[in-house]
């Protein structure tokens, strides 16, 4: 996949990285769907939000997510084997004050209500893919990506960069 640095190389860089600005470089609303064109939807149930992966009925409106993009600078180390340069990180908010969070203990993706500054669990490194899809890598757990498992979003460990094109971690963004 394009833009993918080897997963292992990111390990130190992600933990060392810092968001260079408190304000995003850009933001926009988009619907999120899987590689197989299933929609990511959000439903309020018992005062908490649930995230679903489902086929929408014809003419059914897609849920929109506010994507906020941040630059993250990470240093190269003296020995020359460190990752240098800038990464593009994203937060995803389907409704006011709620953000997608990585729950690394449960290997789950959850919606949490929180105030800014957002915790690291709400930041995902954005990767562009060959198919013009994107993937979202946990800032807090390098090599772990948002993926689809049993019609839900889950955290999926990707062992090598060859596996970064697996369909279950690929998503499409659409403004329509």
């Amino acid at each position: 996949a394009f833009g993918i640095s080897g997963v292992q190389k990111y390990t130190r860089a992600l933990h060392d990285s810092s968001i260079t600005g408190i304000s995003p470089i850009t933001e926009y609303l988009a619907s999120l769907s899987t590689y197989n064109d299933q929609s990511i939807t959000f439903a309020l149930e018992d005062e908490s939000y649930e995230i679903y992966v489902e086929d929408l009925k014809k003419d059914e409106k897609k849920d929109k997510v506010l994507l906020s993009y941040y630059e993250s600078q990470h240093p190269s180390n003296e020995s020359g084997d460190g990752v240098d340069g800038k990464m593009l990180m994203v937060t995803l908010s389907p409704t006011k004050d709620f953000w997608l969070h990585a729950n690394n203990k449960e290997h789950s993706v959850e919606l949490h209500k929180c105030e800014k500054p957002l915790p690291d669990q709400a930041f995902f490194v954005l990767h562009n893919m060959h198919s013009n899809c994107v993937s979202f890598e946990c800032k807090t757990d390098p090599g772990v990506f948002i993926g689809v498992k049993d019609n839900h979003l889950a955290l999926i460990k990707v062992d090598s960069s060859e596996n970064l094109c697996t369909e279950n971690i690929l998503f499409k963004l659409s403004e329509t």
Partner: antibody, heavy 122, light 107 residues
């Protein structure tokens, strides 16, 4: 300081081939996707090809698909473009470029080489 | 493929002038647009990325705006070193495409 230096250009006959190189320094080459862009004399910029950081995924503009091959050697910090079945319309300055973000192409290309001229003529 | 158009194709201006160049995409590219400056015989130089973000080291007289399909590059007070050709590029999806360029020359 980021540096990209292209080489390998020259005069070639139609139908001939050539290999361009781009030597990278001043950054961790193996963490970046890299790109080739060309510019015909007196014309605008044209995207040619992209390769991801470890070389296992490539993409080509329709105009060069099946004729050009992009590759890289991370141990040598070098990007390549093999040009084949060359046509007069391939005559251009070829630039290698690094994308702004390690993980994403959304930021465009922040570093460019000085370019190498490929002349296709009989 | 996404087509990019630019206007005007050329503009004659004087030092101190405000210059505005527009770029239009054939379909929505959100904010993923870059602007480059190129001088004769030189490589392009990134000025603006993500539509409105100034690349490090670029003077603040350059600014970018827009989203979706319509974008603008503005040079607030043209300096002698700004006479060049300017290109927009969509960085939203492969294959990346460039606008045809706008040449800014001396009036």
């Amino acid at each position: 300081e980021v540096q990209l230096v292209e080489s390998g250009g020259g005069l070639v006959q139609p139908g001939g081939s050539l290999r361009l190189s781009c030597a990278a320094s001043g950054f961790t080459f193996s963490t970046y996707s890299m790109h080739w862009v060309r510019q015909a004399p007196g014309k605008g910029l044209e995207y040619v090809s992209t390769i991801n950081n470890n070389g296992d995924t490539t993409y080509y503009a329709d105009s060069v698909k099946g004729r050009f091959t992009i590759s890289r050697d991370n141990s040598k910090n070098t990007l390549y473009l093999q040009l084949g079945s060359l046509r007069p319309e391939d005559m251009a300055v070829y630039y290698c470029a690094r994308q702004t973000y390690t993980s994403s192409w959304y930021g465009g290309f922040d570093s460019w080489g000085q370019g190498t001229l490929v002349t296709v003529s009989s | 493929d996404i087509q990019m158009t630019q206007s005007p194709s050329s503009v004659s201006a004087s030092v101190g002038d405000r210059v505005t160049i527009t770029c239009r995409a054939s379909q929505g590219i959100t904010s993923w647009l870059a602007w480059y400056q190129q001088k004769p015989g030189k490589a392009p130089k990134l000025l603006i990325y993500a539509a409105s973000n100034l690349q490090s080291g670029v003077p603040s007289r350059f600014s970018g705006s827009g989203s979706g399909t319509d974008f603008t590059l503005t040079i607030t007070s043209l300096q002698p070193e700004d006479f060049a050709t300017y290109y927009c590029q969509q960085a939203n999806s492969l294959p990346f495409t460039f606008g045809p360029g706008t040449k800014v020359d001396i009036k």
